[in-house]
Interface confidence: medium
């Protein structure tokens, strides 16, 4: 969590002199409670916006907007504390609006905005706006909170942001996985325009279980420049016994911009469909026997359906 460009953090507007300050997320009014405190924010809205840095990079930001209630407590409103909590890490970042002049009622409802919290793709945040001073212990709360889910890098607008491009969002490997027979998977994917290695992560599961029954990491060496954007194929030779027939193939690139943390793409192959009714036993004897072992190879109708999805 960070703020986009510390320059030009503005909260002043006509009729209000205001400054934005860094905050420890522990306002002084917690420690020294006041008798008279303002009411809570109204209509807190969080939206995904995109902002350029001075260097020209594009980042997703949380656009925070709220209004004031039309009651006399605005006379005691000294500012606001904006807090963003990243839920999976418990990391919190706060800023404080400090009002340098008294608020007065005017013909329009007071509205405040702030768009400088940089957020990460595929993360959830809790955004809280506290009016200051904070209430006395056991006083009515004067804050409003909302959760905000940032889309992942598959989202069209997110895909072109700097953090997504850095993690390889523009690479579409167009993975295809084909079951050649019960023991062979063929994986095809398109290489990116960078001489970097890839890993294929294979995880196999029994038909209706989520316990893996096989896992393997397979290293693909860095392609040469003439192989950029070309299709690469990998044959995974399995021992498909124990009903270990549902395979998830995940491709992990190691681009220089994201190293071990690049977006992974995956495809899944399902177990072959089981016939609803058992094959009828023929009422005649065949005149020939199949060659030893040949019956172990399944026909084309044994091919598991393969579908393509992305995973981060």
């Amino acid at each position: 969590l960070r703020l986009l460009d510390h320059r030009a953090l503005v909260c002043s507007q006509p009729g209000l002199n205001c400054t934005v300050k860094n905050s420890t997320c522990l306002d002084d009014s917690w420690i020294h409670p006041r008798n008279l405190t303002p009411s809570s924010p109204k209509d807190l809205q969080i939206q995904l916006h995109f902002a350029h840095t001075q260097q020209g990079d594009l980042f997703p930001v949380a656009h925070i907007e709220w209004t004031l209630q039309t009651d006399a407590s605005i006379l005691y409103l000294e500012g606001a504390e904006l807090s963003v909590l990243q839920l999976n890490t418990n990391e919190r970042l706060c800023v404080r609006f400090e009002f340098l002049s008294k608020l007065r009622h005017h013909h329009r409802r007071w509205r405040f905005t702030f768009s400088h919290f940089v957020v990460d793709p595929d993360q959830e945040y809790e955004v809280t706006v506290h009016h200051l001073p904070k209430p006395i212990p056991d006083g009515d709360p004067n804050h409003q909170s909302k959760n905000f889910l940032v889309p992942d890098c598959e989202h069209a607008r997110m895909k072109v942001t700097t953090p997504c491009m850095s993690s390889g969002s523009l690479w579409d490997p167009n993975i295809t996985v084909e079951t050649l027979d019960t023991q062979h998977l063929r994986v095809d994917f398109t290489l990116w325009n960078e001489s970097t290695h890839y890993q294929i992560l294979l995880t196999s599961f029994p038909h209706m279980e989520n316990h893996s029954c096989f896992e393997h990491m397979h290293h693909i060496p860095a392609p040469r420049p003439e192989e950029f954007h070309q299709r690469s194929n990998v044959t995974l030779t399995l021992r498909n016994l124990k009903g270990c027939c549902r395979h998830q193939v995940q491709i992990q690139p190691f681009f220089s911009s994201c190293l071990n943390d690049c977006l992974r793409h995956s495809a899944t192959v399902s177990c072959p469909e089981m016939p609803d009714t058992p094959e009828p036993i023929p009422d005649y004897m065949p005149l020939w026997e199949p060659r030893s072992g040949s019956s172990d190879y399944k026909d084309d109708d044994d091919k598991g359906s393969s579908h393509h999805h992305h995973h981060h």
Epitope: S212, C213, S232, V234, T235, L236, R239, L241, G293, D296
Partner: antibody, heavy 131, light 107 residues
Framework: QVQLQESGPGLVKPSETLSLTCTVS????????WNWIRQSPGKGLEWIGD???????NYNPSLKSRVTISVDTSKNQFSLKLSSVTTADTAVYYC?????????????????????????WGQGTTVTVSS | DILMTQSPSSLSASVGDRVTITCRAS??????LGWYQQKPGKAPKRLIY???SLQSGVPSRFSGSGSGTEFTLTISSLQPEDFATYYC?????????FGPGTKVDIK
Amino acid sequence: QVQLQESGPGLVKPSETLSLTCTVSGGSISNYYWNWIRQSPGKGLEWIGDIYYSGSTNYNPSLKSRVTISVDTSKNQFSLKLSSVTTADTAVYYCARDGELANYYGSGSYQFYYYYGMDVWGQGTTVTVSS
Amino acid sequence: DILMTQSPSSLSASVGDRVTITCRASQGIRNDLGWYQQKPGKAPKRLIYAASSLQSGVPSRFSGSGSGTEFTLTISSLQPEDFATYYCLQHNSNPFTFGPGTKVDIK
């Protein structure tokens, strides 16, 4: 290199439960199947069952109703429990690792093989079922 | 279950002899077969995997061949330390099954 060591009581009473543990040293329990095999006196080898480090199990149908195999990845151990034992369960019990990997690289085309089959065995522990 | 049979069940041979042991599967198992050597009081030791691949550290006098239902273990020149019992193991389908063994002793 990987070594396996079976441990557990050498004598079990009929109708009780036989419990054995196999400790894996010199390598990780991850990404392999781990097997139990037994050999009755003067008889051949019988596969009891196996477990993948994720907990996925496979049992010999002839013993399935009495067998439980479990794994403790934090201790690098896997265990066998065989319930309602009789004198016919007297045997040397072995634990063994299953699996061998091989990779082949070509120009733009790669192959990966996985071979099942027990390649590393414990030295075995004798269990006698007797009252 | 896949039934594995071995022949002969025992054989007597001299040092330097060429020895061949056969293993048959009751149904096709591709090349999903290993050969194991066991000496008295010891655990089995794998010699061959995938029907014909020599296990690392095993002398080259041991070789395996076959696919489908018929497999062969050959010892090209029997050495004193090779007197033991030999088992085949199929790992094509559950349950894994071993052959009954072939005991090789000194003539």
